[in-house]
């Protein structure tokens, strides 16, 4: 008998998702309108290209990056798309309600879509830690909670610490990583006997994961520069991110070979380590004054990523139940922290140069900001994890973890597994 989506979930998912979509449509109907004031059509196209880059990163990059499981590749890609589509809608509304609602309706601009795509990207980073262990109904909950938590975090940081769009969005790496790890910690961990093969990677899915990594690698400069307000800052961000990811690729491949007794290169190490530099320079990409610094940062990030990929999976698998190939969570947590530390170092250098305590106070504020991001990520992640454990979601049985057949119709399969 072929695997079927549990009957209760068949009732639950369409009802839950379509009700939510109907609610979103109503909210858009009553509370939003387009920015009809654009004068320059060329400017529109240029502005849209940034948003397009972000969408490619999210849909293709992160979608395929998480698709390396032997029997869960189709779900990884499609569930990512589902979460992105839902997350962007909710993020646009939430950002509008939090930032401009008192003045009347929420005005939708290309910039708000850009912000929303970046917010939704947070979910796609986090979900790497739980993909294969949850169904779509649970992922809907995760999208709603995480986008809401990130939106509120950004608003609080913006108001209390007075950071601009770029700085408060760059907490996304640390936030998404810790959110995902804390959700994973709440979910049932041990894989039952006989299913160990399902969370292993396979050649074709690994190739598509590499494709995802390549798309992310190509578009990471767009991500890091998307929210900067002046051309000089954007230019610096693009250059520094490019240098950093270029060096992290070289480091990832050579470091992976170095880490293997026979000098072989691990696909899993390379998938994540090629992105290391982009994550590490994120916060300070527009501030790094020269290419060699960005390159050194890319080198350090690549080494940390490969080192993490070698030594952390064992711990993560035992404690959090995260499979060896899902290394984005701890990778981003380490590299996001590195990026934040680099920014704090730049603040400290300013303190030394200025010779007054004012910027020292700024260092404390930045540490407070980072701490707040981590605390909110952990708390909202734990809340999400607890919600996902509720019986109403009809989570897949542990024996059916990492299995496309639980969710998808495969006409060529006459029988189950």
């Amino acid at each position: 008998m072929s695997s079927k989506y549990p009957r209760s979930v068949r009732r639950c998912l369409p009802l839950w998702a379509l009700t939510l979509e109907a609610a979103l449509i109503l909210l858009f109907y009553f509370f939003t309108h387009y920015d009809a004031s654009l004068e320059d059509q060329k400017g529109l196209v240029a502005s849209y290209q940034v948003g397009q880059d972000l969408t490619v990163m999210a849909a293709i990059g992160l979608g395929f990056l998480t698709s390396s499981f032997r029997r869960h590749s189709w779900s990884s890609v499609a569930f990512n798309l589902f979460m992105l589509a839902l997350g962007v809608q909710w993020a646009i509304l939430l950002d509008g309600f939090l930032s401009q609602f008192p003045s009347g309706k929420v005005v939708i601009t290309l910039f708000s879509i850009r912000l929303a795509t970046m917010s939704a990207l947070s979910v796609l980073i986090s979900v790497d830690a739980v993909l294969g262990k949850v169904n779509l109904a649970q992922l809907v909950v995760m999208v709603l909670v995480e986008v809401t938590a990130l939106g509120n975090l950004r608003m609080v940081i913006s108001n209390i610490f007075n950071t601009d769009y770029h700085m408060n969005m760059m907490h996304i790496y640390v936030f998404a990583a810790y959110f995902g790890l804390s959700v994973a910690w709440c979910l049932p961990k041990p894989l039952p006997e006989g299913t160990e093969d399902k969370d292993q990677t396979a050649t074709i899915p690994s190739l598509s994961a590499m494709l995802g990594a390549l798309f992310l690698w190509m578009f990471w400069p767009s991500f890091n520069s998307a929210l900067l307000r002046s051309p000089i800052e954007r230019k610096n961000a693009v250059f520094n991110t490019y240098y950093a990811v270029a060096v992290s690729v070289v480091t990832a491949i050579s470091g992976s070979s170095l880490a293997h007794p026979q000098g072989k290169i691990s696909k899993t190490y390379v998938h994540s380590a090629v992105l290391a530099g982009g994550v590490a320079v994120g916060t300070s990409c527009h501030l790094i004054p020269s290419p060699w610094l960005a390159m050194v940062l890319g080198l350090v990030a690549g080494l940390i990523s490969v080192g993490g990929a070698k030594y952390l999976p064992g711990c993560c698998n035992r404690v959090l139940g995260i499979p060896h190939s899902s290394i984005m969570g701890y990778n981003f947590s380490l590299l996001g922290l590195l990026g934040e530390i680099i920014y704090i170092v730049l603040l400290v250098l300013d303190t030394v140069g200025a010779g007054n305590g004012m910027i020292g106070f700024q260092v404390l504020l930045s540490i407070g900001e980072l701490s707040l991001a981590i605390v909110i990520a952990l708390m909202s992640g734990l809340l999400t994890g607890l919600l996902l454990n509720l019986k109403i979601w009809k989570a897949p049985h542990e024996a059916k973890y990492f299995d496309d057949q639980v969710f998808w119709k495969f006409p060529h399969l006459a029988v189950g597994f």
Epitope: L44, S47, V50, T109, R229, L349, D350, G353, A354, M358
Partner: antibody, heavy 126, light 106 residues
Framework: QVKLLESGGGVVQPGKSLRLSCAAS????????MHWVRQAPGKGLEWVAF????????YYADSVKGRFTITRDNSKNTLYLQMNSLRAEDTAVYYC???????????????????WGKGTTVTISS | VMTQSPSSLSASVGDRVTITCRAS??????LNWYQQKPGKAPKLLIY???SLQGGVPSRFSGSGSGTDFTLTISSLQPEDFATYYC??????????FGQGTKVEIK
């Protein structure tokens, strides 16, 4: 020569609309954020609105939010301010100003308005 | 909120003039100073608290960081009689100006 020239001011009744323009020349217009700043008769300067260099993001003072719209056409090197539901308190000289950024130390940028237009007068009177 | 003091002052040519600007909370060194003559547009004098804008005479100088800032004119010239405004660029998007200080001939 770097220059900003405002136009479109005039006398209008409360509740009516007006559209101000600011023509830029002598510099790369699409590389700078642009501001509108106003000055009521005998009063100080009040910032009104700001638009990013690529037009993708806009900010407004609370006093004009929902009524004024800042836009730009980089192909025409022109900045606009669409003013709707005008009130008596909107009477002022309106200046457009270019924003320039400079790097400060290692960890930040400072932004300032380094080029200003001559201003255009808007009078709201019944 | 940016508070300038004094709101007006009278001085003679050659005098050393000091205008202060206080922010309600720290703005680091994100403070700019402008000069405005009657019927004219404002003109940038100092940016980032202490950097002199190109073409501005060296008798103008700025100092301060955090919440307290000062504009100093070391030797007042006839063309310096005008109104001076401070403006913070730290708390975007609210680019607030001080209420202005009018420098008059004694």
């Amino acid at each position: 020569q770097v220059k900003l020239l405002e136009s479109g001011g005039g006398v209008v009744q409360p509740g009516k609309s007006l559209r101000l323009s600011c023509a830029a020349s002598g510099f790369s217009f699409n590389s700078h954020g642009m501001h509108w700043v106003r000055q009521a008769p005998g009063k100080g300067l009040e910032w009104v609105a700001f638009i990013w260099f690529d037009g993708s993001n806009k900010y407004y003072a609370d006093s004009v939010k929902g009524r004024f719209t800042i836009t730009r056409d980089n192909s025409k090197n022109t900045l606009y301010l669409q003013m709707n539901s005008l009130r008596a308190e909107d009477t002022a000289v309106y200046y457009c100003a270019r924003e320039t950024s400079v790097r400060l130390g290692y960890s930040r940028y400072n932004y300032y308005m380094d080029v200003w237009g001559k201003g255009t007068t808007v009078t709201i009177s019944s | 909120v940016m508070t300038q003091s004094p709101s007006s002052l009278s001085a003679s040519v050659g005098d050393r003039v000091t205008i202060t600007c206080r922010a309600s909370q720290s703005i680091r060194s994100h403070l700019n100073w402008y000069q405005q003559k009657p019927g004219k547009a404002p003109k940038l004098l100092i940016y980032a608290a202490s950097s002199l804008q190109g073409g501005v005479p060296s008798r103008f100088s700025g100092s301060g960081s955090g919440t307290d800032f000062t504009l100093t004119i070391s030797s007042l010239q006839p063309e310096d009689f005008a109104t001076y405004y401070c403006q913070q660029s730290y708390r975007a998007p609210q680019w607030t100006f001080g209420q202005g200080t009018k420098v008059e001939i004694k």
